[in-house]
């Protein structure tokens, strides 16, 4: 497949990745699908530097990232290892809180108003951030 060498219109380039910041909300799964349809993924935060960059662009608004534990352990959508990777949870988070009354616990991670992370009900319609890496071969399937 072809390689992406520059970011699409309305995306922001930073450290060889492209980022798109929504201005409306969707449930986590719908945001995940949106990014996939853009040949991207929900943002995966791998460093404090990337955290600060994203935080600067989203402001004090609840915003989905590509981290969830819907199937048990916490996982990044691109396969980045969670256990050894960067984390920025709020104190006492994640807590898989059941007290919200919406059924189930909290399986999807988001940036809170101060940038630190919280787990929340995946159906909440939060803003989100898509990310795609530059110089990565596109996923275009081979022609048969």
């Amino acid at each position: 497949g072809s390689e992406r060498t520059c970011c699409p219109v309305n995306w922001v380039e930073h450290e060889r990745s492209c980022y798109w910041f929504s201005r409306s909300g969707k449930a986590w799964a719908d945001a995940d699908n949106y990014c996939r349809l853009e040949d991207a993924h929900l943002v995966v935060v791998t460093s404090w530097e990337e955290q600060k960059f994203v935080q600067h662009h989203i402001g004090p608004v609840n915003t989905w990232m590509g981290l969830h534990d819907q199937n048990g352990p916490w996982k990044w959508v691109d396969g980045t290892d969670y256990e050894t990777g960067f984390k920025n949870w709020r104190p006492e988070q994640p807590d898989d809180w059941y007290g919200h009354g919406l059924g189930g616990g909290e399986d999807c991670a988001h940036f809170t108003d101060d940038g630190r992370w919280n787990d929340d009900v995946c159906q909440r319609p939060y803003r989100w951030v898509c990310e795609t890496e530059l110089d990565k071969a596109s996923q275009e399937p081979p022609l048969l």
């Epitope: 409306s24 949106y34 319609p125």
Partner: antibody
């Protein structure tokens, strides 16, 4: 000027197959997700499928899942819909449409009629 | 799936009339709503996106409003070329779904 031109429609028997094509021009084809939307005679619009710009991600309506396959050839700026195991209820005008960033369809082709009948 | 309903199903109006069409979603879709115009034998045409944003090239007599589950398309002064069927579409989640359409015809 954006142009989308569908072809490949026609009369087919139940259980048969058909492949629709949509030739695109006037925009950077590989940068946009593309979709198929159909309209049965006298009925409303029904979304069928969508594919990402690279072809790496696809989504389908439950009514066609497992029977229809959406694909694209970016070198030919062409979108395809392979339709298998066709049923009478698949009879419709099939439109290809360009999906814009806000999950709407900003440009449409003129449509191609698919009739499934014995 | 998110169900979209429209009312009325048809409306008879005269040139110069103000016409309003409503669209209701079965669950909250924020502002992920579009309106299309379709004439017989023709492809749909995008009029409004994000519930209230006017698509480039569309006359300003068309406007959209609403958020959450209830939305309205208004034609402030109906013109001869506006007699058509109008449909709403939600882009909040897959599968994308359309309303059944509202036909605007001549009184």
């Amino acid at each position: 000027e954006v142009q989308l031109l569908e072809s490949g429609g026609g009369l087919v028997q139940p259980g048969g197959s058909l492949r629709l094509s949509c030739a695109a021009s006037g925009f950077t084809f590989s940068s946009y997700a593309m979709s198929w939307v159909r309209q049965a005679p006298g009925k409303g619009l029904e979304w069928v499928s969508v594919i990402s710009g690279s072809g790496g991600s696809t989504f389908y309506a439950d009514s066609v899942k497992g029977r229809f396959t959406i694909s694209r050839d970016n070198s030919k700026t062409t979108l395809y819909l392979q339709m298998n195991s066709l049923r009478a209820e698949d009879t419709a005008v099939y439109y290809c449409a360009k999906r814009d960033w806000n999950d709407v369809f900003d440009y449409w082709g003129q449509g191609t009629l698919v009739t499934v009948s014995s | 799936d998110i169900q979209m309903t429209q009312s009325p199903s048809s409306v008879s109006a005269s040139v110069g009339d103000r016409v309003s069409i409503t669209c209701r979603a079965s669950q909250d879709i924020s502002n992920w709503l579009a309106w299309y115009q379709q004439k017989p034998g023709k492809a749909p045409k995008l009029l409004i996106y994000a519930a209230s944003s006017l698509q480039s090239g569309v006359p300003s007599r068309f406007s959209g409003s609403g958020s959450g589950t209830d939305f309205t398309l208004t034609i402030s002064s109906l013109q001869p070329e506006d007699f058509a069927t109008y449909s709403c579409q939600q882009g909040n989640s897959f599968p994308f779904t359309f309303g059944p359409g509202t036909k605007v015809d001549i009184k």
